[in-house]
Interface confidence: low
């Protein structure tokens, strides 16, 4: 069958006829819908949210729409015994405690289960000790503190400020560092812009508003009780002490009027240069311990949250594909919530709810895609990617022999500037000719392209005309389809200018603000922003699943390969005489992007050429664009992190949000002129630049011609 | 529209003491931190208190502690400054001005509303 | 204390000339900093917070920049009606000092 015959729509109004459906009222209902009540992953709202979502997406037109059920480990605070922050005197006495919950928004007062701001799988403890500031808590921070400084962490508690990376990683390094309790708060300087108010009145974070979120550092591995397998009703679970990526230490999240109460008695050393202050009207001494008349008062955490196996729920639904129906197209994205889940994760959800809805209007007219698309409301995002995890885990062996791509839809605005777009290499053309033919929602660009405006508000840094798509990283539900299973995959959302709100994420990221009217009132009254939102990403999803020829450009790959491979030589040659003494030798690499660009080449000359009425070599050349993805997973995966098994990009081992090229080289090489054994560190430099160029290699030849 | 009107300024004899008056109109006067700013003849701006939204909270410059009190009257959007014994080198015009919070509840930032002023002599 | 010095004191300048007032902390005060203009016989109006976001209805010739401890009001192409004492403010403790002001004159 060629893919007319799957439409009773003509091809070129496919799309068209899908993008016009979209409605950005529609957006606005769903966003609302969602929005009124708490749905905390494991809870009982939320259960109803996932049946109410299956319920629509049937009515909605698709074939089938299933509920997926695991049992994971989850975290909550103790509902009698509440986590707090106290400074307390030489007689033990507590002289202040820090906020037990959020000032609720207005018209949230009499909303139940709002559960107060806390540390997802924060051990149990109340230690008591003086205390350090770490600023961001990064690796480099940490460098400063006992390397230039000679602050000894160990016994100390810490208290970091959110932002630059992802909180677990903060945590992480406290532990490294011997820390025996985590503060994490939000600094004005990251999470409020100036000349804006905070909630209720403006998009800033009020000083009683505290950011959730999990501290683990699971590294791709899902459930923490069951590593590499799904956690179904006969799962072997590990012993607690076994779990993946627990913190040690007790960890809680405090904002900023609190962090004021604190940080102002700090004493100790000073801060060590401008970067380490924020915007409190507080020295930011580093400490250890309080000034002068309060070196006597301590801190104190009490931390009683409770580890607990809890049963989870994904909604997966199907529309079958007319042509390849063994091909997958996934567009998924997660329903949990810390609270109201405003942004997150409701005007991405909202958005999925009006893509589905489209696809089952055309579908109920006769039409369906080529390929089959799967439309996934992933549970447990918020505790570490753990429904999408363990429902990718349960059926690997599918995805890794029918995966065509993954489009995530998390968030669908984190400001209202221009575009912003993650995706894999083999992505970038669809999405450049895609942001063509769409019309940017932004002011003063009327009647000009998306591509257009997020050009010239995003520039790439590379290729002028052309505009910034990153890396993937982590932090989000594509990470076991990308990083485990090697699967193509991209995300898009609306960004804030990145120039000039320097502040880390949004705001009222994962606070009690995060509500309906946070987004009607401030963000995107008319919903235009969601509307283009929900057109890239539907729009992807349709090429995706209904191009006759997969709209995957090889050479892409080839470009970046040879990029990432001069950043990674060039960072290796900090060191020439170390290269030197080792004999360390880039060459097999850079012969091996060599041989991709020809190959690639040459692949991408016969797909415009060869006979696309012959089903079986259609079929053929496109299961080598769709395997491509899949050739850069080393089974055997990166060193320590056996669920990062893509060789060419991973989140960083500094911050999981962000994504590194070629890490297994990187991470040889990081820090690597303070290793004990430099012999034995610069062996694993050569084995991992041996491992890249291998696997580069081996990815050209699945393009090469096949006999 | 929004403003600032000031009042009680003139001549007062070295020791002596006179109050300041403020009247704020076309805004929340109860959400605003206030401030009082001095001009001597000639001279660049000094400035001399603040006072939180609800009076509990008060800062002054180091030369008026214990002499000058800034006080408020939400009920009456008025903002007061009690100057008590009183120095030649007190001798300014004086400003109210409101405090503009743009960053969160913060107790010193940009003045955006002044006052037009009021001339404060002490002399013998 | 934080002490705010500024430079220079007075400036002779055209109308159509760029301006550029420097304002030094004898501290690190991250960016809270604002800057006035005051004209005689009138009270200061405020012309940049934060170091360097424009006050409302100020024009956009006026821009502000710098962090930490060193800070910079520029003036493009100066009009006549530029032509005043300029102050820097530091906000990042008590007591809040000002600069010594910076007077604008026609050359």
């Known amino acids: 069958k060629s893919s007319n015959e799957a439409t009773n729509i003509t091809p070129k109004h496919n799309m068209k006829a899908f993008l016009d459906e979209l409605k950005a009222e529609n957006i606005k209902k769903f966003l609302y819908n969602f929005t009124q009540i708490p749905h905390l992953a494991g809870t009982e709202q939320n259960f109803q949210l996932a049946k109410q979502i299956q319920s629509q997406w049937k009515e909605f037109g698709l074939d089938s729409v299933e509920l997926a059920h695991y049992d994971v480990l989850l975290s909550y605070p103790n509902k009698t015994h509440p986590n707090y922050i106290s400074i307390i005197n030489e007689d033990g006495n507590e002289i202040f405690n820090t906020s037990l919950f959020e000032p609720p928004p207005p018209g949230y007062e009499n909303v139940s289960d709002i559960v107060p701001p806390f540390s997802a799988f924060s051990p149990q403890g109340m230690p008591e000790g003086d205390l350090v500031y770490v600023n961001y808590a990064r690796t480099e921070d940490f460098f400063k503190l006992e390397r230039d400084m000679k602050i000894n962490c160990s016994g100390k508690i810490v208290i970091a400020r959110y932002g630059k990376v992802f909180r677990g990683n903060k945590v992480k390094n406290a532990q490294l560092a011997g820390a025996k309790g985590v503060i994490l708060y939000s600094d004005p300087a990251d999470y409020f812009a100036p000349g804006v108010k905070s909630y209720p009145d403006g998009w800033n974070l009020p000083g009683g508003g505290v950011q959730r979120g999990n501290i683990l550092n699971l590294n791709g591995a899902g459930d923490p009780l069951t590593p590499g397998y799904p956690a179904n009703e006969y799962a072997y679970r590990r012993g607690i002490a076994e779990a993946v990526g627990l913190p040690s230490i007790p960890v809680h999240p405090i904002g900023y009027y609190d962090a004021q109460k604190l940080l102002e008695k700090m004493g100790g050393s000073a801060p060590p240069d401008s970067s380490w202050r924020g915007s409190l009207k507080v020295p930011y001494n580093v400490g250890p311990g309080f000034t002068g008349n309060f070196s006597t008062q301590k801190v104190k955490m009490h931390i009683h949250s409770t580890n607990e196996v809890t049963r989870i729920y994904n909604v997966i639904g199907t529309l079958r594909g007319a042509v390849e129906p063994d091909r997958y197209v996934i567009l998924g994205g997660h329903r949990d919530s810390w609270v109201f889940g405003g942004i997150d994760p409701q005007s991405g959800a909202a958005v999925v709810h009006e893509i589905v809805r489209s696809f089952g209007t055309l579908k109920k007219e006769g039409w369906r895609p080529r390929r089959t698309i799967l439309f996934a409301s992933w549970d447990a995002e918020e505790f570490g990617l753990l429904g999408s995890t363990e429902w990718a885990e349960e059926n690997s062996r599918l995805l890794q022999e029918r995966g065509v791509a993954y489009i995530n839809a998390d968030s669908s605005i984190e400001g209202n500037y221009t575009l912003r777009v993650d995706c894999t290499p083999l992505m970038y053309s669809l999405v450049h000719n895609l942001t063509k033919e769409l019309k940017s929602p932004d002011e003063g660009f009327e009647g000009k392209s998306l591509y257009e405006s997020w050009t010239k508000k995003s520039p790439s840094p590379e290729f002028s005309g052309m505009p910034r798509i990153s890396k993937l990283g982590s932090g989000n539900d594509f990470e076991v389809f990308f990083q485990r299973l090697g699967i193509a995959s991209g995300r898009a959302r609306y960004t804030k200018n990145w120039e000039t709100n320097k502040f880390s994420g949004y705001p009222l990221y994962h606070s009690v603000y995060e509500t309906y009217e946070l987004v009607e009132k401030f963000y995107d009254p008319m919903f235009k922003y969601h509307l283009t939102v929900a057109q890239v990403r539907g729009g992807m999803v349709f090429e995706l699943a209904n191009s006759i020829v997969l709209p995957f450009d090889c050479r892409d790959y080839a470009v970046v390969l040879r990029k990432y491979a001069d950043k990674i030589y060039s960072i290796s040659m900090k060191h020439p005489q170390e290269m030197k003494t080792y004999s360390v030798s880039f060459d097999s690499l850079f012969s091996a992007v060599k041989n991709f660009t020809e190959i690639a080449s040459k692949f991408s000359e016969r797909l415009q050429d060869f006979d696309k009425s012959n089903p079986i070599v259609l079929r053929m050349m496109n299961d080598q664009l769709m395997f491509l993805e899949r050739a850069f997973i080393d089974p055997l995966g990166l060193p320590d992190r056996p669920f990062y098994r893509h060789v060419i990009y991973a989140p960083s081992s500094h911050n999981k949000y962000a994504g590194e090229s070629f890490p297994g080289i990187y991470d040889a090489l990081f820090d690597i002129e303070s290793k004990v054994d430099p012999s034995k560190a610069w062996g694993e430099v050569k084995r991992q630049i041996y491992v890249a160029a291998f696997t580069v290699q081996a990815a050209a030849e699945t393009l090469s011609e096949v006999a | 529209q929004v403003q600032l009107v000031q009042s009680g300024g003139g001549l007062v004899q070295p020791g002596g003491s006179l109050r300041l008056s403020c009247a704020a109109s076309?805004?929340?006067?109860?959400?605003?931190?206030m401030s009082w700013v001095r001009q001597a003849p000639g001279k660049g701006l000094e400035w001399v208190a603040n006072i939180k939204q609800d009076g509990s909270e008060k800062y002054y410059v180091d030369s008026v502690k214990g002499r000058f009190t800034i006080s408020r009257d939400n009920a009456k959007n008025s903002l007061y400054l009690q100057m008590n014994s009183l120095r030649a080198e007190d001798t300014a015009v004086y400003y109210c001005?409101?405090?503009?919070?743009?960053?969160?509840?913060?107790?010193?930032?940009?003045?955006?509303?002044w006052g037009q002023g009021t001339m404060v002599t002490v002399s013998s | 204390d934080v002490v705010m010095t500024q430079s220079p004191s007075s400036v002779s300048a055209s109308v159509g000339d760029r301006v550029t007032i420097t304002c030094r902390a004898s501290?690190?005060?991250?960016?809270?900093l604002a800057w006035y203009q005051q004209k005689p016989g009138k009270a200061p109006k405020l012309l940049i917070y934060?170091?360097?976001t424009l006050q409302s209805g100020v024009p956009s010739r006026f821009s502000g920049s710098g962090s930490g401890t060193d800070f910079t009001l520029t003036i493009n192409n100066l009009q006549p009606e530029d032509f005043a004492t300029y102050y820097c403010q530091q906000t990042a403790s008590f007591p809040i000092n000002f600069g010594g002001g910076t007077k604008v004159e026609i050359k």
């Open positions: 501290q690190g005060i991250s960016s809270w």
């Open positions: 001005a409101r405090v503009w919070d743009y960053y969160y509840d913060s107790s010193g930032d940009a003045f955006d509303i």
């Open positions: 934060a170091a360097s």
């Open positions: 076309g805004f929340t006067f109860s959400s605003y931190w």
